[in-house]
């Protein structure tokens, strides 16, 4: 698995320069998410015909993947930081369910989705202390998290190979979303 | 990286439209967040406009926001800046920049990818 950022060599070697920011960090670790991703889309796309699929509204239905709309407050019309920041937050620890359904489903790329789980976990400890409006910010229910996982993992094999596509698709996209928003903050 | 090839530019009046347009040959446009900035001579570069991977997200300078539009077509890998009532202070080469996280941004450090510009001049 890749480095994660801020231990790379090159970080190592050049001692004297400036600590990140809190926002630089933030940029850095969604970009490093990003970067795992595309490996574990690679082998998606290698392994099935998924990422060409156009049956994937069927398995949308079963799946409730946060989005980001208007409505958010992360888009340039209507921006607010802080109703941004919530909706970042409370997607991240919404996907995290979704994230722990991928730990088997790599062969080669095993290690990998562990770091994209992980690092995301660390993303949403950076960007909860970017938060002044913690109590806005609601946690999935465990049980039903649980459930959900049963229910995904008990699906057929085609079933599993698109929920895995949709879901690497959706994070990404999640990502990318919020990380517009956060270069505006 | 990817090549990216500006078209449209040319010289206008005060008031009038124009639009920029600008392809790439990259198979995966649509992964690509895409922008436009320009430089007016003795000026630094400066941002105009961007668009993320999903046609809805978008973000525009202050200075041209409900002027001009930016929209994407990934079945043709082409950017568009549809600029009306343009004025003498759009007089700029307009360059067209792609991300190839996706995300995008005001800031030319976040495009990994440049084009060569394209000359717009509004006469007043």
């Known amino acids: 698995a890749p480095v994660p950022p801020g231990e790379d060599s090159k970080d190592v070697a050049a001692p004297h320069r400036q600590p990140l920011t809190s926002s630089e960090r933030i940029d850095k670790q969604i970009r490093y998410i990003l970067d795992g991703i595309s490996a574990l889309r690679k082998e998606t796309c290698n392994k099935s015909n998924m990422c060409e699929s156009s049956k994937e509204a069927l398995a949308e239905n079963n799946l409730n993947l946060p989005k980001m709309a208007e409505k958010d407050g992360c888009f340039q019309s209507g921006f607010n930081e802080e109703t941004c920041l919530v909706k970042i937050i409370t997607g991240l620890l919404e996907f995290e369910v979704y994230l722990e359904y991928l730990q088997n489903r790599f062969e080669s790329s095993e290690e990998q989705a562990r770091a994209v789980q992980m690092s995301t976990k660390v993303l949403i400890q950076f960007l909860q202390k970017k938060a002044k409006n913690l109590d806005a910010i609601t946690t999935p229910d465990p049980t039903t998290n649980a459930s959900l996982l049963t229910k995904l993992q008990a699906q057929n094999q085609w079933l599993q190979d698109m929920t895995t596509h949709l879901i690497l698709r959706s994070f990404k996209e999640f990502l990318q979303s919020s990380l517009r928003a956060l270069r505006q903050m | 990286q990817v090549q990216l090839q500006e078209s449209g530019g040319g010289l206008v009046q005060a008031g009038g439209s124009l639009r920029l347009s600008c392809t790439t040959s990259?198979?995966?446009?649509?992964?690509?967040?895409m922008a436009w900035f320009r430089q007016a001579p003795g000026k630094d570069r400066e941002f105009v406009a961007d668009?993320?991977?999903?046609?809805?997200?978008?973000w525009y300078a202050e200075s041209v926001k409900g002027r001009f539009t930016i929209s994407r077509d990934n079945t043709k890998n082409t950017i568009y800046l549809q600029m009306n009532s343009l004025k003498p202070e759009d007089t700029a080469v307009y360059y067209c920049?792609?991300?190839?996280?996706?995300?995008?941004?005001?800031?030319?450090?976040?495009?990994?990818?440049w084009g060569q510009g394209a000359q717009v001049t509004v006469s007043s």
């Open positions: 920049a792609a991300d190839s996280y996706g995300v995008g941004g005001g800031k030319q450090e976040y495009y990994d990818s």
């Open positions: 668009i993320g991977t999903n046609s809805e997200n978008t």
């Open positions: 990259g198979r995966t446009f649509s992964d690509y967040a």
